[in-house]
């Protein structure tokens, strides 16, 4: 008699999961030799005892703590670029600008960037067939608990001047509800960050307006600023070009707005 | 079996560019780094650079900066170099080959050869 | 960028006899984590390099168990116990444990 399988609303587990991270953990491990210490076995037990055998909607940060402890890492504290809506550019502006880094530039960031995972309860299978979505199922799921917890850490180690990347194209081009505007943005410590400094970056070719003036960005600086840190604001009218400055910054036409 | 499959040999006028390729089989392309060697004229090897297929982070030697670009296709599971304004230093084999699981280059492509003459 | 160092050519070997071959490293290649980050490369003639040794002691696979190496953090020692006609090549050591990597510039082994 086949057993009965909880069908949850999102996708279920990425195929080739174990071996994906596995795999992630030793690529990243051998280009980063400051992180060869890590032991990516263990990694991989770490992360699967985070969910494993436990009910998908009832996963807690504690639940990740051995792998959070497997996966420390120091990076420059003021050369964090956090991001909402708009990964890809954030990406390929820390790999040409490599002292920057993204959540995603950091070994746990990396493992389970554009991963799905969730087991089931009292069973050691690992469910392909559907996750819980955070929205229509429920919200301590493995997936969102991790990113919230790597997030939160993340923002908690930054100082001096945080940059942020947000999407000018959205209705919303500051989120409450998204992980920056949820977790980053509320555990930014003011003891350490001078600054949060955003960078709109704008998607249509002759969208000349200031976007830093649209009402959800002037919301961020109001809870940046009874946080007491200071916000600024910039425009990033062409983000091909942006990126093109970034490479080549001697470049005559990189002294203009962009 | 795992095979690193490189284009045939290119011949190019200084100044020039040309991109070469290396077409992986027998793995899961997305599971390791490839990284890109060169031996000059008999002479030792030189780390290029790598790629992680899984996303296209790039990580270069810094004497190949601006020389190397390197990029991946996921579907054809295939990896390229392109090598830009070419002069006869760039005349040379390039292998292609791909990291282990305790990251020596475990397996090797037959090498490219790249003569640049006017 | 660290250095390998190798001399560019073996004492020549008589077959069935055993060859060293050493190298030297800039810097320790030892990590905090206890592997040594340095490895052996064979090119034979008119082929491409093969992996023989990882991490400074461990055989690759399909690699005959006459090959060995040894050493401290710069210094190192690859040992052939039994040479035989198939082991001509050059043999370039190298490290991974710094980018960039890098490779010694060959020593080649000459039968008698």
């Known amino acids: 008699v086949p057993r009965w399988r909880q069908q949850w609303s999102g996708p279920g587990t990425t195929k080739r999961f174990p071996e994906t991270v596995l795999a992630r953990c030793v690529k990243y491990t051998e280009i980063h030799p400051e992180m060869r210490h890590v032991d990516c076995q263990s990694v991989w037990d770490a992360f699967k005892g985070a969910f494993i055998s436990k009910h998908p909607c009832n996963i807690t940060e504690e639940d990740y703590q051995p792998l959070m402890k497997l996966g420390t890492q120091t990076v420059p504290c003021n050369k964090i670029l956090l991001w909402s809506r708009i990964k890809d550019l954030a990406h390929q502006f820390t790999q040409v600008q490599r002292d920057m880094f993204t959540l995603e530039d950091t070994l746990l960031g990396y493992l389970a960037d554009d991963l799905t995972w969730c087991g089931e309860f009292n069973t050691s299978k690992i469910n392909y067939q559907s996750c819980p979505d955070w929205r229509k199922d429920c919200s301590n799921n493995p997936v969102s608990v991790f990113w919230k917890t790597v997030s939160r850490r993340f923002a908690e180690a930054a100082c001096d001047v945080v940059h942020v990347m947000l999407n000018g194209s959205r209705s919303k081009i500051f989120d409450k509800n998204s992980t920056f505007g949820s977790v980053e943005v509320h555990n930014l410590q003011p003891e350490k960050v001078q600054t949060l400094e955003a960078w709109v970056i704008h998607g249509g070719r002759e969208d000349s307006r200031d976007l830093c003036q649209d009402p959800t960005i002037k919301e961020l600086e109001s809870i940046i600023s009874k946080r007491n840190i200071q916000f600024s604001c910039k425009n990033i009218y062409r983000p091909d070009k942006f990126l093109q400055c970034v490479k080549n910054p001697e470049d005559s036409s990189c002294t203009s707005e962009i | 079996e795992v095979q690193l499959q490189q284009s045939g040999p290119e011949l190019e006028k200084p100044g020039a560019s040309v991109k070469i390729s290396c077409k992986a089989s027998g793995y899961s392309f997305t599971d390791y780094n490839m990284n890109w060697v060169k031996q000059s004229n008999g002479k030792s090897l030189e780390w290029i650079g790598n790629i992680d297929p899984d996303y296209g982070g790039t990580t270069y030697n810094q004497k190949f900066k601006g020389k190397a670009t390197l990029t991946v296709d996921k579907s054809s599971s295939t990896a390229y170099m392109q090598l830009r304004s070419l002069t006869s230093e760039d005349s040379a084999v390039y292998y292609c080959?791909?990291?282990?699981?305790?990251?020596?280059?475990?397996?090797w492509g037959q090498g490219t050869l790249v003569t640049v003459s006017a | 960028d660290i250095v390998m160092t190798q001399a560019a050519f073996s004492n020549p070997v008589t077959l069935g006899t055993s060859a060293s071959i050493s190298c030297r490293s800039s810097?320790?290649?030892?990590?905090?984590?206890?592997?040594?980050?340095l490895y052996w490369y064979l090119q034979k003639p008119g082929q491409s390099p093969q992996l023989l040794i990882y991490?400074?002691?461990n055989l690759a696979s399909g690699v005959p168990d006459r090959f060995s190496s040894s050493g401290s953090g710069t210094d190192f020692t690859l040992r052939i116990s039994r040479v035989e006609a198939e082991d001509v090549g050059v043999y370039y050591c190298a490290q991974n444990l710094e980018l960039p990597w890098t490779f010694g510039g060959g020593t080649k082994l000459e039968i008698k």
């Open positions: 810097k320790s290649l030892l990590h905090s984590n206890g592997i040594t980050y």
């Open positions: 991490q400074m002691s």
């Open positions: 080959a791909r990291s282990g699981y305790r990251y020596g280059f475990v397996y």
